[in-house]
Interface confidence: medium
């Protein structure tokens, strides 16, 4: 069967997100991938969306992230825009209303996004073959 258009959009967004550092891509998020052995794919997507939502809700107006130059400000706004898009698309793939996220292991946002990108690319290669 063909790959979901949402999946392609997620990979595209993740590629954009992981291309550049901002002042806040090194801030830390809950690492939902550390203990995801007994977790369904839909639960993983749901938890990933929850983590991203927590991040952008907390840091959208964080002065450290907005920076002090026009370039830093623009890059942060772009980061938040991409995270919101990713959040929306992940919810679409998950098809779940909510999911628990335990505050356990920590990962930087950039590492979290790289891990998510690997998972999504694997999923894409399976559905496109």
């Amino acid at each position: 069967h063909k790959c979901d258009i949402t999946l392609q959009e997620i990979i595209k967004t993740l590629n954009s997100l992981t291309e550049q550092k901002t002042l806040c891509t090194e801030l830390t998020v809950t690492d939902i991938f550390a203990a995801s052995k007994n977790t369904t794919e839909k639960e993983t997507f749901c938890r990933a969306a929850t983590v991203l939502r927590q991040f952008y809700s907390h840091h959208e107006k964080d002065t450290r992230c907005l920076g002090a130059t026009a370039q830093q400000f623009h890059r942060h706004k772009q980061l938040i825009r991409f995270l919101k898009r990713l959040d929306r698309n992940l919810w679409g793939l998950a098809g779940l209303n909510s999911c628990p996220v335990k505050e356990a292991n920590q990962s930087t946002l950039e590492n979290f996004l790289e891990r998510l990108k690997t998972i999504m690319r694997e999923k894409y290669s399976k559905c496109s073959s």
Partner: nanobody
Framework: EVQLLESGGGLVQPGGSLRLSCAAS????????MGWARQAPGKGLEWVSW????????YYADSVKGRFTISRDNSKNTLYLQMNSLRAEDTAVYYC?????????WGQGTLVTVSS
């Protein structure tokens, strides 16, 4: 366990300089953005400066821009804040911080008093 230990505070005259240090342990220092915040007597916490792991991106609050310089030595797990042209309004407890997303790890703080 994350530990952040600030030092270098003290009493200084207006126009003077101080260099704050923050010794970090309990985590891989070179992987994380770090920063300084301060709390003046009777006021809220204010972010002063922030630096990413590589040191290539920095943030400064408008109130300290051009006077303060943040830097880090990843080989020594140490964060620095060079403070020049100090003013009375810079008097505060200065905290070293490692942010964990919605959670921040803070040091105990070091007091900087600018007075003649």
């Amino acid at each position: 366990e994350v530990q952040l230990l600030e030092s270098g505070g003290g009493l200084v005259q207006p126009g003077g300089s101080l260099r704050l240090s923050c010794a970090a342990s309990g985590f891989t220092f070179r992987n994380f953005g770090m920063g300084w915040a301060r709390q003046a007597p009777g006021k809220g916490l204010e972010w002063v400066s922030w630096i990413i792991s590589s040191g290539t991106e920095t943030y400064y609050a408008d109130s300290v821009k051009g006077r303060f310089t943040i830097s880090r030595d990843n080989s020594k797990n140490t964060l620095y804040l060079q403070m020049n042209s100090l003013r009375a309004e810079d008097t505060a407890v200065y905290y070293c911080a490692k942010s964990l997303g919605r959670f921040d790890y803070w040091g105990q703080g070091t007091l900087v008093t600018v007075s003649s």
